[in-house]
């Protein structure tokens, strides 16, 4: 955790690092370790990759224990093979508007992700890709007998775009906040980030929070009921304490986690909230970190690593933070 103790390195000479990850001396000058990458947790002993201009951002001067690897101010972003300057906005596809900020990319969907339930007016709603349109749009297949409510007016026209929500326009500032990114880990403690200008100075800033989609040790597939293919939100029987680089949460939490599927789908957070969690470290120091708490999960085929980088990127993001 810190450098006060003597140097103790693993028996094997040097770890093998994945491609593109630097082998560096740890922060104590003791052992060679694989450098932590952008968005990963870092400590004094686990340094960030200096060759990529990363530093360990501890968030506040009071907390010098655990930070997040962050790009230095003004660091560019590499996205889809293109380099973008910090502060630059770009449309990654017709469906997403993205912003680069100090090495981190935050994207906002330009298409509505709304859901439509059947009703007498729209008994068989379908989302379809219309020629010449980027976003899928709702189409209501009329029932066979044509006993549709309301007069049979000309085919309805879908609004193509919505202006900014007026409540989100402050004096000389169009408030924009990207979705929280998907958790950096599919199990165990990870990091989720977003970009926002929702602050007094209307300046773009990065925000990060801890996240845990599911514990790594849980064998969730065992709990899938016979005949079912997924367990969306498995029951966690007992309250748990979160662990973060040797520090333990002060309170216990009856947290919700996302389950698994046996048919190739993945289950990811759908609705989440962000709450502060206090961690107590062995030396008695207490630090406060924002953490994602899951309200509901969704199981879908838009899994990490799917063909369309933008689709899988967005669908793995949180559907929206609820207060």
């Amino acid at each position: 955790q810190n450098c006060s103790g003597p140097c103790r390195c693993p028996a094997e000479q040097a770890p093998r690092c994945p491609a593109g990850v630097s082998l560096v001396l740890d922060g104590c000058g003791c052992c060679r370790v694989c450098a932590k990458q952008l968005g990963e947790l870092c400590t004094e002993r686990d340094p960030c990759d200096p060759h990529k201009g990363l530093f360990c951002d501890f968030g506040s001067p009071a907390n010098r224990k655990i930070g997040v690897c962050t790009a230095k101010d003004g660091a560019p972003c590499i996205f889809g093979g293109t380099v973008y300057r910090s502060g630059e906005s770009f449309q990654s596809s017709c469906k997403y508007q993205c912003t680069c900020l100090d090495g981190a990319v935050g994207c906002m969907p330009l298409c509505s992700m709304d859901v439509r339930l059947p009703s007498p007016d729209c008994p068989f709603p379908r989302r379809v890709k219309l020629p010449g349109k980027c976003c899928e749009e709702w189409v209501c297949d009329e029932p066979k007998d044509q006993t549709v409510v309301g007069p049979a007016l000309a085919a309805y026209r879908l609004e193509d775009t919505f202006g900014p929500d007026p409540t989100m326009i402050r004096a000389n500032c169009l408030v924009q906040t990207t979705e929280w990114s998907a958790c950096s880990k599919t199990c165990g403690m990870g990091i989720s980030t977003r970009v926002t200008n929702d602050n007094a100075s209307c300046r773009l800033e990065k925000q990060s929070r801890l996240c845990m989609v599911r514990p790594c040790e849980a064998d969730l597939e065992e709990n899938i009921k016979k005949g079912k293919k997924c367990i969306r939100t498995p029951k966690i029987s007992k309250p748990i304490k979160f662990e973060l680089s040797g520090c333990t949460s002060v309170k216990t939490y009856r947290a919700k986690f996302c389950g698994v599927c046996t048919d190739g789908r993945c289950c990811t957070p759908h609705r989440t909230t962000t709450l502060p969690v206090e961690f107590k470290c062995p030396d008695g120091e207490v630090m406060k970190k924002n953490m994602m708490f899951i309200k509901t999960c969704a199981c879908h085929y838009n899994c990490p690593g799917d063909n369309d980088i933008f689709e899988s990127l967005y669908y793995r993001k949180m559907y929206g933070d609820m207060a």
Epitope: R116, P118, S119, P120, C140, G150, L153
Partner: antibody, heavy 114, light 110 residues
Amino acid sequence: EVTLKESGPVLVKPTETLTLTCTVSGFSLSTFGVHWIRQPPGKGLEWLGVIWRRGGTDYNAAFMSRLTISKDTSKSQVVFTMTNMDPVDTATYYCARDGGFDYWGQGTTVTVSS
Amino acid sequence: ETVVTQEPSFSVSPGGTVTLTCRSSIGAVTTSNYANWVQQTPGQAFRGLIGGTSNRAPGVPDRFSGSILGNKAALTITGAQADDESDYYCALWYSTHYVFGGGTKLTVLG
């Protein structure tokens, strides 16, 4: 984010006309209909009427002669008008999106009193 | 006049399963009635749970499910939680209008 918000007077005199506006965001009125529902104090829900995505309307038969619902799609607004108000019409009035009544406004409480 | 009837009140233990029903005075409930279920929380806020008999609204946990049981529409809550304590209303469509039931007050014991 889908939101609906009702606005209008909180106090109406008997025999007067009540006009409420439901302003929506996050969806288009040409894609979804909007219902009006009310809840008298301490009682259950009463469906009043709907304007569908294509402009047609349906009303609760008990209010047919007093009710009009219209919309301005470009302004994302639905207007609800109820004539000849009576003290028994005192209630919280809600607009809700068609399709499972999945999203509701926060409601506006209307008191009918002289 | 068509009347839609719900149980006035129901109680369930935490973790238990409860089924609320919705009966029509003019015959069996079918999918053509597009049964909707709406929750009113103690804070008076409404949210749709189920539309078109059995379709969950976005963000509604899969503990909530809608179906037709015999001649009635039904809302089943499995693994009941303390924050499920609310009023639940069903609404049925009758060709030209909806009718709401009187609502069920659900109490989660303990």
